[in-house]
């Protein structure tokens, strides 16, 4: 893996404005299937993907002006188990309902200090920040 | 949404060994669930998420240098149908395995120009970049 | 043995809200799943929709939009409720018990003798 | 939705004779997991309500006389009534229950020729 510069001192070129976070227009970043009103357990047969799975869910917004991206939206699944794809609307517990987890690469906009301790700037500092994706529907583990 | 410099000189502080993009060791960006080996339509009732789950997939990696992550994971899913919650075998078509997609922030490495059009190290551009997370479990659309 | 009764208006004015009860005798309603249909005179049967006795309820897309089922557990009942209805809902509308087995709906046993509904000014 | 389709709409048949009554599905009601069709058929005479007949396509309900069988198999089923007795005089509906919107056939008128 290469390796290259992640700190941005505050001073120095390029100017300010180029230092936006984003070089292109960027718009809030919100899955496209974001329905904070699906709170229903239940497979709809229309809408976004979330409210049309057997193991739906919603999204919880998370927002951090100090990290990139600034906006994370967790899913919470609405049922604990699958719902009936006969039917869309009674739950099936021959399968669980689980949430998908993600390590994703975020970054942290932390102070820097110079070799005598001033503030020199903001540095930018990667993580991984667990989110979930959405929420799947699995056989349940067989414990041998 | 406030705004944060994103471009780094390559010159000056800090130090190219504090200018690594990772203030803290992160493994490689790889999926938990991540298992190339699964590639049947199945359902099994062991190991990971996308090998349990009813809408199985399998893990492509998408590597790039010049971004950040370099690494990146595409879900594939292994079935058209959703597997039967009951043998974890048979398709069984009432159920569509859909891929869910996500614009995921990613940043590139591009060479910053001085005001006399000299290279002056490397800026951050974020982007916004389509990724398949995982296959989902959905009741076809209904047509109206 | 179970037995299914429907009661109600047999007359509804255009507009307004065709409401019809099912009586359940001889099983629980809390046991089963409890349907509706209906059948327009002289043509086929069209699903409505069912409800468990929880609430959890499934309707055709073709009435969703007007269609409410609920159920009265302390008086083994379940009710309908089609509002904003046309001379096109005249119907004989039937109650019926959907057979559950392996988490999955089945078959419709046994069914009310019906009750005809008139959607006349 | 899975649009189910008759056929004949009427059928005339001699006392003792057999009739054959079809039904099409447009889409397949077959489950390969449990290897079962989602298919039920129904009787119903004048004045009364629907009564089971036939269910998973070939299975005959209890108390239903050995001359009324199903078959069939994915999209297309028949139902057979093996000499025909008058009190069989009735309207038969199949009906498919893979997937909601549950949903009938129009139906096929039997009389006695």
């Known amino acids: 893996y290469s390796h290259w510069p992640s700190c941005c001192p505050s001073k120095g070129y390029p100017s300010e404005e180029l230092l936006r976070w984003s070089t292109v227009p960027v718009p809030p970043l919100k899955p496209a299937s974001l329905d904070f009103h699906s709170v229903s357990c239940r497979a709809s047969e229309d809408g976004p993907l979330n409210s049309r799975a057997i193991s739906p869910w919603r999204y919880e917004l998370d927002r951090d002006l100090n990290r990139l991206p600034q906006d994370l939206y967790h899913a919470r699944c609405l049922c604990p188990h699958c719902v009936s794809l006969q039917t869309g609307s009674h739950m099936d517990p021959r399968g669980n309902s689980e949430l998908l987890y993600h390590n994703q690469t975020v970054f942290y906009r932390r102070p820097c200090h110079g070799k005598k301790g001033n503030h020199k700037g903001y540095c930018l500092e990667r993580r991984l920040y667990r989110v979930s994706l959405a929420c799947v529907c699995v056989r349940p583990r067989v414990m041998g | 949404y406030s705004h944060w410099p994103s471009c780094c000189p390559s010159k000056g502080y800090p130090s190219e060994e504090l200018l690594r993009w990772s203030t803290v060791p992160v493994p490689p960006l790889k999926p938990a669930s991540l298992d190339f080996h699964s590639v049947s339509c199945r359902a099994s009732e062991d190991g990971p998420l996308n090998s349990r789950a009813i809408s199985p997939w399998r893990y492509e990696l998408d590597r790039d240098l010049n971004r950040l992550p370099q690494d990146l994971y595409h879900a594939r899913c292994l079935c058209p149908h959703c597997v039967s919650l009951q043998t974890g075998s048979h398709m069984d078509p009432r159920g569509n395995s859909e891929l869910l997609y996500h614009n995921q922030t990613v940043f590139y490495r591009r060479p910053c120009h001085g005001k006399k059009g000299n290279h002056k190290g490397y800026c951050l551009e974020r982007r916004l970049y389509r990724v398949s997370l995982a296959c989902v479990c959905v009741r076809p659309r209904v047509m109206g | 043995q179970v037995q299914l009764q429907e009661s109600g208006p047999g007359l509804v004015k255009p507009s307004e809200t065709l409401s019809l009860t099912c009586t359940v005798s001889?099983?629980?309603?809390?046991?089963?799943?409890w349907s509706w249909i209906r059948q327009p005179p002289g043509k086929g049967l069209e699903w409505i929709g069912y409800i468990f006795y929880s609430g959890n309820t499934n309707y055709n897309p073709s009435l969703k939009s007007r269609v409410t089922i609920s159920v009265d557990t302390s008086k083994n009942q379940f009710s309908l409720k089609l509002s904003s209805v046309t001379a096109a809902d005249t119907a004989v509308y039937y109650c019926?018990?959907?057979?559950?087995?392996?988490?999955?709906?089945?078959?419709?046993?046994?069914w009310g003798q019906g009750t005809l509904v008139t959607v006349s000014s | 939705d899975i649009v189910m389709t008759q056929s004949p709409d009427s059928l005339a048949v001699f006392l003792g004779e057999r009739a054959t009554i079809n039904c099409r599905s447009s889409q397949s009601v077959f489950l390969g997991s449990n290897n079962k069709n989602y298919l039920a058929w129904y009787q119903q005479k004048p004045g009364q309500p629907p009564k089971l007949l036939i269910y998973?396509?070939?299975s005959r309900e209890s108390g239903v006389p050995d001359r009324f069988s199903g078959s069939g198999s994915g999209t297309d089923f028949t139902l057979t009534i093996n000499s025909l007795q008058a009190e069989d005089v009735a309207v038969y509906y199949c009906?498919?229950?893979?997937?909601?919107?549950?949903?009938f056939g129009g139906g096929t008128k039997v009389e006695i020729k």
């Open positions: 009906q498919q229950y893979f997937i909601t919107p549950l949903t």
């Open positions: 019926a018990r959907v057979r559950f087995s392996d988490y999955e709906l089945n078959w419709f046993d046994p």
């Open positions: 001889g099983a629980s309603i809390s046991n089963y799943y």
């Open positions: 998973w396509a070939s």
